[in-house]
């Protein structure tokens, strides 16, 4: 079987994650995203930092980035709404809402994902699914097809150890283990899904991947329910 996916994961079952989005810049994959409403995709604010004059679009219904697939469709972005408190030099509030130019055509391969509204930490050890088209090995190879990996949630105290993220993990962030299996470059903005519900969004900080002492950092969507609702309203 193929190895070294996402980092240490494997190729996802095609179209089994109908909420998965590829945020694209000038026709190339930039970041992950997650369809949270018919016309809205949630991603990471830092993803658009370098997008100044480029054309941002959202690909839905895709498994392969390059191959034709009946369910695939590229949507223009009507409006990009980064969280008002997101800043280039911090991982805090790293959320972005993209309004599609029209409502997505829903079907088996395109479907919004319910997101967590109850502001309570996911229990440490819970296995959560993260998926994306980010790099898959230490060479930096980028995959054509969607990859995924199951990661255990890591408690905040451990994640905040001096040897780990040294106090940077606020109550609005969560961590997942990163020992060889991890999200990595290009997975930013993608979903961390626990029990079929969106719990986190991959932050787009420039983090070393696959090192157990540098756990993956995810923005807790429940902590931003009010902001998400206000934008989607």
């Amino acid at each position: 079987p193929p190895r070294g996916r996402i980092l240490g994961g494997r190729e996802a079952e095609a179209h089994a994650r109908p909420y998965m989005a590829s945020v694209q810049l000038n026709g190339a994959h930039l970041c992950g995203g997650v369809l949270v409403a018919e016309q809205w995709v949630l991603s990471a604010a830092h993803c658009l930092e370098d997008a100044a004059d480029g054309k941002v679009q959202v690909l839905l219904g895709a498994h392969s980035l390059s191959q034709p697939e009946p369910s695939k469709r590229l949507y223009d972005v009507l409006r990009a709404v980064p969280h008002p408190d997101s800043q280039p030099d911090t991982i805090d509030h790293d959320l972005l809402l993209l309004q599609l130019s029209e409502k997505a055509t829903l079907g088996p391969a395109v479907r919004p994902l319910p997101w967590q509204r109850v502001d309570r930490d996911v229990a440490p050890g819970t296995l959560c699914d993260v998926a994306g088209w980010g790099i898959v090995n230490h060479a930096g190879r980028r995959p054509d097809s969607l990859q995924h990996v199951l990661l255990p949630v890591l408690d905040r105290a451990t994640c905040n150890r001096r040897t780990h993220h040294d106090g940077a993990i606020t109550e609005r962030l969560m961590c997942a283990e990163s020992n060889r299996r991890d999200s990595c470059k290009g997975d930013s903005g993608g979903p961390l899904v626990c029990g079929g519900v969106l719990e986190g969004v991959v932050t787009s900080g420039s983090r070393v991947c696959g090192n157990r002492k540098k756990p993956g950092i995810y923005t807790r969507v429940a902590s931003y329910a009010a902001w998400i609702d206000s934008v989607l309203a």
Epitope: G4, I135, N137, H138, R141, K185, S206, V208
Partner: antibody, heavy 113, light 106 residues
Framework: EVQLQQSGPELVKAGASVKMSCTAS????????MHWVKQRPEQGLAWIGR????????KYDPKFQGKATITADTSSNTAYLQLSSLTSDDTAVYYC??????WGQGTSVTVSS | QIVLTQSPEIMSASPGEKVTMTCSAR?????MYWYQQKPGSSPRLLIY???NLASGVPVRFSGSGSGTSYSLTISRMETEDAATYYC?????????FGSGTKLEIK
Amino acid sequence: EVQLQQSGPELVKAGASVKMSCTASGFNIKDTYMHWVKQRPEQGLAWIGRIDPANGNIKYDPKFQGKATITADTSSNTAYLQLSSLTSDDTAVYYCTSAMDYWGQGTSVTVSS
Amino acid sequence: QIVLTQSPEIMSASPGEKVTMTCSARSSVSYMYWYQQKPGSSPRLLIYDTSNLASGVPVRFSGSGSGTSYSLTISRMETEDAATYYCQQWSTYPFTFGSGTKLEIK
């Protein structure tokens, strides 16, 4: 089209330093890792190290630690390799590669005494 | 560091012949890359993650293996396949190369 354009050949004196460049087109170097590989005349390949241009994180083969310095400038989409205290053992062709799938044409370095 | 030993060092094959070369690791690795290099040219990626064909590589090339033993096979040798072939492990820093197998045309 993805391309990696490396700087031209270098003839340098023993003990000196040299810095070569690798400019990418058709992709953003921040999106992957940039590696450097050494090949001495009539010999095999040796992995020197790699840089993650997005955060400056670098990994070297310990054999090249202190000899090689890898850097990147994301504004010009360019990776660099600097070699210091050159000896005849550093006479080689140096390749840059993105994710090991796209390769530059190589920069020939000749160290003269 | 992980030492990779390629064998044979030199081999020759006739057009149409099946060719297999091996790469053995001193300790277990999780996946292997294979490259082709012709004189005066840059290396070219052939196989990534042990068995996946890189873009534009003819389907006569294939890779297999696990643990400490990996191989590259050319199902039917063609004259343009005369080159030196290198394996490289991507499991453990530093990411070492094998010493190469030189394939000549008979």
